[in-house]
Interface confidence: low
């Protein structure tokens, strides 16, 4: 009765910093009774190793067993549905889960003004699952990259960005008062990780933010 | 809301030079980005420069280096675009057009257009 | 530069169709790419920016989407008043260049 099960049709990873989640989608028609069986191999270590024997859930945070991701080959993983005692073929994810798979994101974005420049600061995450010694910029040591979107409100501009190479930036307002809206996107020059979009910071800038000068 | 509105149409003799203007109101001009794009009869759009504010300085689109020259009046709101040594491939409809401030920008706000005959 | 390839170079199609033009730089743009709608004898006007952020007082039936290379223009009912030539345009970099240009005409 072993394959009497259909397989789940695709097992996936999405991760960022330290925070490594396998996704699946489920199988058709499945019973209130119907898991997943979740395995990962470690390239080098060529054997699989069972990570959970009854997920009723469609992901699984592999974040704990897969600490070492940047300092490897990488992984893989696959997950299989059970049914009591029946159960389906394994779907292996398709590419090798690796550093490079990971969505870069930052922290936060702190604002503030001076004399007219909007300060900024980009927090780098510092997720509580990573060991003391992998810190974003320890493992990300060159070439950290940050793309800046600009939104003043209001006023009928589109988004306009500008890109800088530290984790501090300044904009120059131009004189102009009203709510700046900022967000950010990491990127590492040198790699093909993704980014995402940081949420909207916004600061109000007032007349009392310029100082005169003679 | 902005408002850009460019002078009238200009005829103008090969080798000569045309200076055409973009009127900003609801906004001043420093807090804007102002680009000049051209259309050609039946062609496509085609960037000629704009003022980048991260360097300060205005970018000239390689073709037309040495050519062209956008400067603004900030007293009156007043950006212009001259272009010299006219030759007739230089007839088009010239378009001021401008975003917001930071950067390289989409072109939210465009000037009604200002048609440049050049013709012997 | 940044080589802005657009296709097609022109389309028919009839009042109600689902219309989809897309725009294909030559290196990657991030979401840094602009529409524009132009008709004849008018200035362009500005559609989506950020490839996907409709401008105010646009019609909600466009919408824009895709980030990189590789972009799209959708208008999901056609009407009367969109028939005209629709521009790409990326501002990752300069030089800021545009597309070529779809025209969209009535069968």
């Known amino acids: 009765h072993g394959t009497e099960l259909p397989s789940p049709p695709s097992v996936w990873f999405e991760a960022e910093f330290f925070h490594h989640i396998l996704h699946w989608t489920p199988i058709p028609n499945q019973s209130e009774s119907t898991c997943y069986e979740v395995a990962l191999l470690r390239y080098g270590i060529e054997s699989w190793n069972s990570i959970s024997n009854c997920s009723q859930t469609l992901s699984y945070d592999l974040t704990a067993v897969t600490l070492d991701l940047y300092h490897s080959n990488g992984y893989r993983a696959r997950v299989r549905a059970v049914d009591g005692s029946r159960h389906s073929n394994w779907t292996v994810t398709n590419t090798r889960f690796s550093v490079d798979e990971v969505t870069l994101t930052v922290g936060s974005v702190n604002l503030e003004i001076h004399n007219g420049f909007i300060l900024g600061k980009i927090q780098l995450p510092r997720p509580k699952m990573a060991p003391a010694n992998d810190t974003y910029e320890s493992i990300f040591s060159h070439f950290r990259e940050y793309e800046i979107a600009i939104r003043k409100v209001p006023g009928n501009f589109t988004f306009t960005h500008k890109k800088v190479k530290h984790e501090n930036f300044s904009l120059l307002t131009s004189g102009e008062v009203g709510e700046f809206c900022v967000q950010v996107k990491p990127s590492v020059a040198s790699r093909s990780n993704k980014g995402m979009w940081s949420k909207e910071e916004c600061i109000s800038l007032t007349r009392q933010y310029f100082t005169v000068t003679n | 809301q902005v408002q850009l509105v460019q002078s009238g149409a200009e005829v103008k003799k090969p080798g000569a030079s045309v200076k055409v203007s973009c009127k900003v109101s609801?906004?001043?001009?420093?807090?804007?980005?102002m680009h000049w794009v051209r259309q050609a009869p039946g062609k496509g759009l085609e960037w000629m420069g704009g003022?980048?504010?991260?360097?300060?300085?205005?970018i000239y689109a390689q073709k037309f280096q040495g050519r062209v020259s956008m400067t603004e009046d900030t007293s009156t709101d007043t950006a212009y675009m001259e272009l010299s040594s006219l030759r007739s491939e230089d007839t088009a409809v010239y378009y001021c057009a401008t975003g917001g401030y930071y950067g390289p920008v989409g072109m939210d706000v465009w000037g009604q257009g200002t048609t440049v005959t050049v013709s012997s | 530069d940044i080589q802005m390839t657009q296709s097609p170079s022109s389309l028919s199609a009839s009042v109600g169709d689902r219309v989809t033009i897309t725009c294909r730089a030559s290196?990657?743009?991030?979401?840094?790419l602009a529409w524009y709608q132009q008709k004849p004898e008018k200035a362009p006007k500005s559609l989506i920016y950020?490839?996907?952020s409709l401008q105010s007082g646009v019609p909600s039936r466009f919408s824009g989407s895709g980030s990189g290379t590789d972009f799209t223009l959708t208008i999901s009912s056609l009407q009367p008043e969109d028939f005209a030539t629709y521009y790409c345009?990326?501002?990752?970099?300069?030089?800021?260049?545009f597309g070529g240009g779809t025209k969209v005409e009535i069968k």
């Open positions: 345009q990326q501002y990752n970099s300069y030089p800021l260049t």
């Open positions: 950020a490839a996907s």
């Open positions: 609801g906004f001043t001009l420093t807090e804007l980005s």
């Open positions: 003022f980048d504010p991260d360097d300060g300085e205005t």
């Open positions: 290196q990657g743009i991030s979401i840094w």
